[in-house]
Structures are given as structure tokens and as C-alpha cells.
């Protein structure tokens, strides 16, 4: 199809080489309820669409995304050619940063309902650049945590070094929906609830004498509980003796509950004590068996191919540790009688 009639938007993604970060493009077509596709004035860069197109409109929620190759080749369907780009309804998610993401991206509705709709499309010219020598040492992260039940704030990474007074007007989106009343470089959250978790996008306009473009950053916001003040506790084994049959295989499970920690480095391991000696046992990898906002239960098994007489003289010790401290539980094997 002819893309010369598409409205055009220029975007800049300046990514940090130090952190993983994502990016999104919205298909900013006009809302179908407000007009029949493109039959309304285009938005100037200073205007903000009332909210994103097609959101909440089932029949029009699907759009087609293409990339325009720089060599003039025909448009390429994003889904076929770019595994690191994911389409979700009207949004295109870039999972990895890199200058190779620069280019022209075109979206249009899948359902073309009338001859007028053919020209209903948006062309987004995306420029991707690595951040130059950390222009600001303490720029906000693209991953931000909010502590449940307390106050918090979400900062726009590309503007976090500017004071509120200097900051340009910012347009914020949460999970693809415009937050029309939030216009500063920092959103204040009066009290953090779980619904504050999500993907936030902040946009502002930058201009030079020739043209203007939208600078965009994406922030993944996670709601968390406060770091635990407790060392982990061992849920299993509970008993310090275990009846076993000689010559038979045996698996002993150690399950431990670790309270939430923002920087989480859980340790769960088995070691064996035999008279004055003790050594760590090479056992299968630990696995998380239950994870909630407040804590995580991790399990690690020790496997004996067959129980020997020597094993009855040993103590099998499960050792668990977090940043607060450690806990151990030892198990002595006892031969089953009869």
C-alpha cells in the first residue's frame, strides 16, 4: 500500500549501555469512536491524543505493523522478520536496545472498511542512540520499585536530572493508556498499591531549528513489600531423624521460606557431617516452588542412589541463608526395623 499519505511521527530512544531496557511504539491512529478512522485533523506534536486508539474497541484493536527497509525494498511484516520485536494489540515492544532498531515503522488497521481507510496509517521514524558518557550520573533507572503501603514516585529516566522547574511538559502512559493529568517529569504516588505495577512510558518533545521529535523512555514499575528482617526458615525436613531402608534409593527434600529482599541472593545447600569432617554435597539445582509478593519457597533435594551403613553414621545438614542470617536443619538416618 502507498505510505505517502501516512501521518509521520519522529521518536528518539536513547538507551543506557549499562542496563537492560525496553521500548514501545504506540499505533497512534485516531479513535474510531470519535471519527471514522482518519477523518479528523492530525495532532500537532504539542497536542496529546485524548487516549490511545482502539483501546477498548474490540473490532479495531488489531493493527498491522511493518518496517520500511532503508534500501527502498517493499515493506516487511514485523512479525515475520524481527523476533526481538513483539506486537501486542496496538503496541510494538522492543525487547532489546540497539542502534539496529533505528528505522521507519508503519502501522495501519488490519480491517480496511472503506476506501478512505487505505491512507489511514502512521509512520514512525525511530532513531536509536546509546547514551553518551552518562550525561547525568544519577539518572533514574528503567526498572523502578515502589514499596507497598508507602509513598513513592516514578521518574522519567530521560529527564530525571532536571528540576521540575526546568522540565518540559511530559506525556505519561501506563500500560498503553494515557495518564492525561500527569504532566511533570515525576509522578507522585500518594500510597502504593499493587495496581501501580506496570509499564510506564514518558514522552517529551525536543526541537531544533529544523524539526521536532518525541523523546521516549520506558519504565518497568514493580510494587514490592519491604525487605524482610528475618532469616529464612526451613519448612522441611521438620524431624531430625528419618527412617530408611538400607540398599534403597533415598531423596531428602529441603524446603525453605525466604522473605522478600530487593537484592535477593538466597543460599540453599546440603552438606554432610561425618565425625570431624564436613563437606558440601553436589546436588540438583534448587528450584522455586512458590513465589508471592512477601516470600518465596525454594526447594533443593539431596539424592542417595542407595542408602549404606556408612550413611547411618552421618548427619545430612540443610543450610539456608539470606542477607539477614542462616538456618540449618540436620537429619540423622535410622534403619527401619521389621
Amino acid at each position: 500500500f502507498n505510505i505517502s499519505g501516512c501521518s509521520t511521527k519522529k521518536l528518539l530512544w536513547t538507551y543506557s549501555t549499562r542496563s537492560e531496557e525496553e521500548f514501545v511504539l504506540f499505533c497512534d491512529l485516531p479513535e474510531p469512536q470519535k471519527s471514522h478512522f482518519c477523518h479528523r485533523n492530525r495532532l500537532s506534536p504539542k497536542q496529546v491524543p485524548e487516549h490511545l486508539p482502539f483501546m477498548g474497541s474490540n473490532d479495531l484493536s488489531d493493527v498491522q505493523w511493518y518496517q520500511q527497509p532503508s534500501n527502498g525494498d517493499p515493506l516487511e511484516d514485523i512479525r515475520k522478520s524481527y523476533p526481538h520485536i513483539i506486537q501486542d494489540k496496538c503496541t510494538l515492544h522492543f525487547l532489546t536496545p540497539g542502534v539496529n532498531n533505528s528505522g521507519s515503522y508503519i502501522c495501519r488497521p488490519k480491517m480496511i472498511k472503506s476506501p478512505y481507510d487505505v491512507a489511514c496509517c502512521v509512520k514512525m521514524i525511530l532513531e536509536v542512540k546509546p547514551q553518551t558518557n552518562a550525561s547525568c550520573e544519577y539518572s533514574a533507572s528503567h526498572k523502578q520499585d515502589l514499596l507497598l503501603g508507602s509513598t513513592g514516585s516514578i521518574s522519567c529516566p530521560s529527564l530525571s536530572c532536571q528540576s521540575d522547574a526546568q522540565s518540559p511538559a511530559v506525556t505519561w502512559y501506563k500500560n498503553g493508556k494515557l495518564l492525561s493529568v500527569e504532566r511533570s517529569n515525576r509522578i507522585v504516588v500518594d500510597e502504593v498499591y499493587d495496581y501501580h505495577q506496570g509499564t510506564y512510558v514518558c514522552d517529551y518533545t525536543q526541537s531544533d531549528t529544523v524539526s521536532s521529535w518525541t523523546v521516549r523512555a520506558v519504565v518497568q514499575v514493580r510494587t514490592i513489600v519491604g525487605d524482610t528482617k528475618l532469616k529464612p526458615d526451613i519448612l522441611d525436613p521438620v524431624e531430625d531423624t528419618l527412617e530408611v531402608e538400607l540398599g534403597k534409593p533415598l531423596t531428602i527434600s529441603c524446603k525453605a521460606r525466604f522473605g522478600f529482599e530487593r537484592v535477593f541472593n538466597p543460599v540453599i545447600k546440603w552438606y554432610i557431617k561425618d565425625s570431624d569432617l564436613e563437606w558440601e554435597v553436589s546436588v540438583p539445582e534448587a528450584k522455586s516452588i512458590k513465589s508471592t509478593l512477601k516470600d518465596e519457597i525454594i526447594e533443593r533435594n539431596i539424592i542417595l542412589e542407595k542408602v549404606t551403613q556408612r550413611d547411618l553414621r552421618r548427619k545430612f545438614v540443610c543450610f539456608v541463608q539470606n542477607s539477614i542470617g542462616n538456618t540449618t536443619q540436620s537429619v540423622q538416618l535410622k534403619e527401619k526395623r521389621g
Epitope: 487516549h51 477498548g56 509513598t151 493508556k177 509522578i187 500518594d190
Partner: antibody
Framework: EVQLEESGGGLVQPGGSLRLSCAAS?????????MCWVRQAPGKGLEWVAC?????????YYANWAKGRFTISKDLSKTTLYLQMNSLRAEDTATYFC????????????WGQGTLVTVSS | DIQMTQSPSSLSASVGDRVTITCQAS??????LAWYQQKPGQAPKLLIY???NLASGVPSRFSGSGSGTDFTLTISSLQPEDFATYYC?????????????FGQGTKVVIK
């Protein structure tokens, strides 16, 4: 008993100022509420004016038409809410209600009985 | 600011009738919507919060539904004490649960 009581209403000339108060009793502002002002012109509907968060952020929120002329504030020690109204116009004539959000049932679960403000020369 | 549009502005009904009032938000507010009842000379009373939850002490003949931009308040069988004015309200502002803009109201009168 949990209640809100507005005061400070009365007759004021156009261009004049007035400060409304809302005394809260039976609960503490420390529990972090949105305390708000809503007005109702005679025979008309409810109109949101402004809100303030009584928690540490002290965030304030205003209807677009109220920005610049009206200021909401609070005194935690007196558990009192205020609305400073400047450059008053005839169209500001209304009963002004003080209301508190309900932390569970999102919305205004508690209302005062209102105070009448008349702007007239 | 979000605009809330209610319809109809007034309706006449009889005791026992099923009454439906609609409210439309100018942008999606998910389910952050409250409904109030106001009788002459009184402060409003919260009926429904979070679009469909009944506030404490409110009779079960009142119900709310909807999400996004379109919402409905239904009175399944109108009682004499239900003749009043009803308002919808957005209860979210940016990222905070601040009750704010009201609809213009629907007056329910006796037929």
C-alpha cells in the same frame, strides 16, 4: 462519632475572598485520607473543587476551573481542612461540602452538611 | 480533567419499575467509578464504588456495572424512598485514587 462540619460561609462581594473550614472529628488525618471540597450551586448538580492527601506527600488536586483562584490546605494538629477562595464571582455561589474518601469503598463515604457561600453585590 | 456525562438528565418512573441510568467517561477509568444518591436538602450518599460494589448499608436492589468508559446504575425495583438525584463520579486521578469529576446528575421523579 465520625463527622465533618463546615464553617466560614456567608455573603461576600464579587472579587472578594473567603476561607472555609471543615473540622473533622472521630478520626485522625494521620490515617492518610483524601479530604476534598465539593460544591453545589442552587438547583444544580455536584461539582468537584479540590482534594488534598493528608499523608506525607500532601499532594493537592484541583478541578481545572479552580486552579489559581482556590487553594486547599490542612492543619493536621487541628484535623481541619481549609479552602481559601479568592477573586470570587457570582457563579461561585453554592453550598460547599467537605468530604472524605473511604479507603476501602473508593468514593466519598463521609460528607459534611455543607456551608452556603453567596457572592453578590 | 475527565468529563463525566450522564443520561438521561431526568426520568419519570413508578414504584416497582426497573430504572437504568448511564454514565460515560471522556477517557477510560477502568472500574474507578462511584454512584451517589442525593435527596433535597441532604448531603449525597455513596451507593456503589469500584463500578459494581455495593457500599455498606445499601439495599441490594441497587447495582452497578461497566468498565472503561461506559457505566450503568440499575435499580431493579424502584421504591418510594428511591426518588432522588443520582450522580456518577470518577474516583481516579492520574495514578492516585482521588475521587474527582461528577456527572451532571439524573433526577428520578414519580410518574
Amino acid at each position: 462519632e465520625v463527622q465533618l462540619e463546615e464553617s466560614g460561609g456567608g455573603l461576600v462581594q464579587p472579587g472578594g475572598s473567603l476561607r472555609l473550614s471543615c473540622a473533622a472529628s472521630g478520626f485522625s488525618f494521620n490515617n492518610n485520607y483524601y479530604m476534598c471540597w465539593v460544591r453545589q450551586a442552587p438547583g444544580k448538580g455536584l461539582e468537584w473543587v479540590a482534594c488534598i492527601y493528608t499523608g506525607s506527600t500532601g499532594s493537592t488536586y484541583y478541578a481545572n476551573w479552580a486552579k489559581g483562584r482556590f487553594t486547599i490546605s490542612k492543619d493536621l494538629s487541628k484535623t481541619t481542612l481549609y479552602l481559601q477562595m479568592n477573586s470570587l464571582r457570582a457563579e461561585d455561589t453554592a453550598t460547599y461540602f467537605c468530604a472524605r474518601d473511604d479507603k476501602v469503598e473508593h468514593g466519598y463515604g463521609l460528607w459534611g452538611q455543607g456551608t452556603l457561600v453567596t457572592v453578590s453585590s | 480533567d475527565i468529563q463525566m456525562t450522564q443520561s438521561p438528565s431526568s426520568l419519570s418512573a413508578s414504584v416497582g419499575d426497573r430504572v437504568t441510568i448511564t454514565c460515560q467517561a471522556s477517557e477510560s477509568i477502568d472500574n474507578w467509578l462511584a454512584w451517589y444518591q442525593q435527596k433535597p436538602g441532604q448531603a449525597p450518599k455513596l451507593l456503589i464504588y469500584s463500578a459494581s460494589n455495593l457500599a455498606s448499608g445499601v439495599p441490594s436492589r441497587f447495582s452497578g456495572s461497566g468498565s472503561g468508559t461506559d457505566f450503568t446504575l440499575t435499580i431493579s425495583s424502584l421504591q418510594p424512598e428511591d426518588f432522588a438525584t443520582y450522580y456518577c463520579q470518577s474516583t481516579f486521578y492520574g495514578v492516585n485514587p482521588v475521587p474527582n469529576a461528577f456527572g451532571q446528575g439524573t433526577k428520578v421523579v414519580i410518574k
